[in-house]
């Protein structure tokens, strides 16, 4: 059974992941329109089901494309702190949260989604898991 300290650690990691994803989303939403139009042509795979920490496998598999689009769109009006570090940090948290004991084959939804829909989906996931922990 999970101890209160491991639950607390999981909660903190989820909160960190949530903040990182929200930071990216805020950066995109503050973006001036021509850039956003371009970014929205970059499509992401969405999880068919995301209700447990092990489903973070689906997020992990899309981190490379996420880094790619953030690098491509990097500009004066849209500037995240070092994208490589940011994605690397997210990756570390995701690996710790999902655990490495079982390798899940990620099941994706039938339709791809925009970066905004993708980030919102994983933000909702984090919020949902955090609420069950508290």
């Amino acid at each position: 059974a999970p101890t209160s300290s491991s639950t607390k650690k999981t909660q903190l990691q989820l909160e960190h992941l949530l903040l990182d994803l929200q930071m990216i989303l805020n950066g995109i939403n503050n973006y001036k329109n021509p850039k956003l139009t371009r970014m929205l042509t970059f499509k992401f795979y969405m999880p068919k089901k995301a209700t447990e920490l092990r489903h973070l496998q689906c997020l992990e598999e899309e981190l490379k494309p996420l880094e790619e689009v953030l690098n491509l769109a990097q500009s004066k009006s849209f500037h995240l702190r070092d994208t490589k570090d940011l994605i690397s940090n997210i990756n570390v948290i995701v690996l710790e949260l999902k655990g490495s004991e079982t390798t899940l084959m990620c099941e994706y939804a039938d339709e791809t989604a925009t970066i905004v829909e993708f980030l919102n989906r994983w933000i909702t996931f984090c919020q949902s898991i955090i609420s069950t922990l508290t």
């Epitope: 042509t41 499509k43 339709e111």
Partner: antibody
Framework: EVQLVQSGAEVKKPGESLKISCKGS????????IGWVRQMPGKGLEWMGI????????RYSPSFQGQVTISADKSISTAYLQWSSLKASDTAIYYC??????????????WGQGTTVTVSS | DIVMTQTPLSLPVTPGEPASISCRSS????????????LDWYLQKPGQSPQLLIY???YRASGVPDRFSGTGSDTDFTLKISRVEAEDVGVYYC?????????FGGGTKVEIK
Amino acid sequence: EVQLVQSGAEVKKPGESLKISCKGSGYRFTSYWIGWVRQMPGKGLEWMGIIHPGDSDTRYSPSFQGQVTISADKSISTAYLQWSSLKASDTAIYYCTRQGRSFYYYGMDVWGQGTTVTVSS
Amino acid sequence: DIVMTQTPLSLPVTPGEPASISCRSSQSLLDSDEGNTYLDWYLQKPGQSPQLLIYTLSYRASGVPDRFSGTGSDTDFTLKISRVEAEDVGVYYCMQRIEFPLTFGGGTKVEIK
């Protein structure tokens, strides 16, 4: 090997309908946009439009909007270009192209072999 | 739509010699905010499908020999071939993708003298 294989040459009469295909292989078909380019006899290249097979998001060049329909069936990794009523001026070679995860950020890195469409009475 | 104009229409070349093709756009292809110039070059060899040579102004596509290079800024662009080889004959097209719809230049036919 990454490739786009197009359907064979077609000879049609004005007013007839037609659907040509483009099958992708060697890569994850639903990750990339597929575009269509027209080349009329002895002429240059014209960009017609594009589709994302992952969610069927489709964009047309204003010159081709309403003239053709672009579609895709991701279950068989195939994109289509169709006409409901052909005209003699539709006679051309039609190429399908792969255009990256975003058509703004990437060039057309893979091209099909082309489908020759001849419309004549 | 952005209009792309290529010159010359035809370019006779001598193998081993350098060659240049020009392309001009009706508006800037430079995204000054990003620092990228959204111009590509394609080559269509006789009887073949076009192939990507250069993307985003100066990046060589995979497998493209280093004798090909792309330069330019804003609205004026050049494709350079440092030493032309017989296999370089065909029609060269520039294409913009800064704005929808994407548009091609009319093409420059490169042939051996």
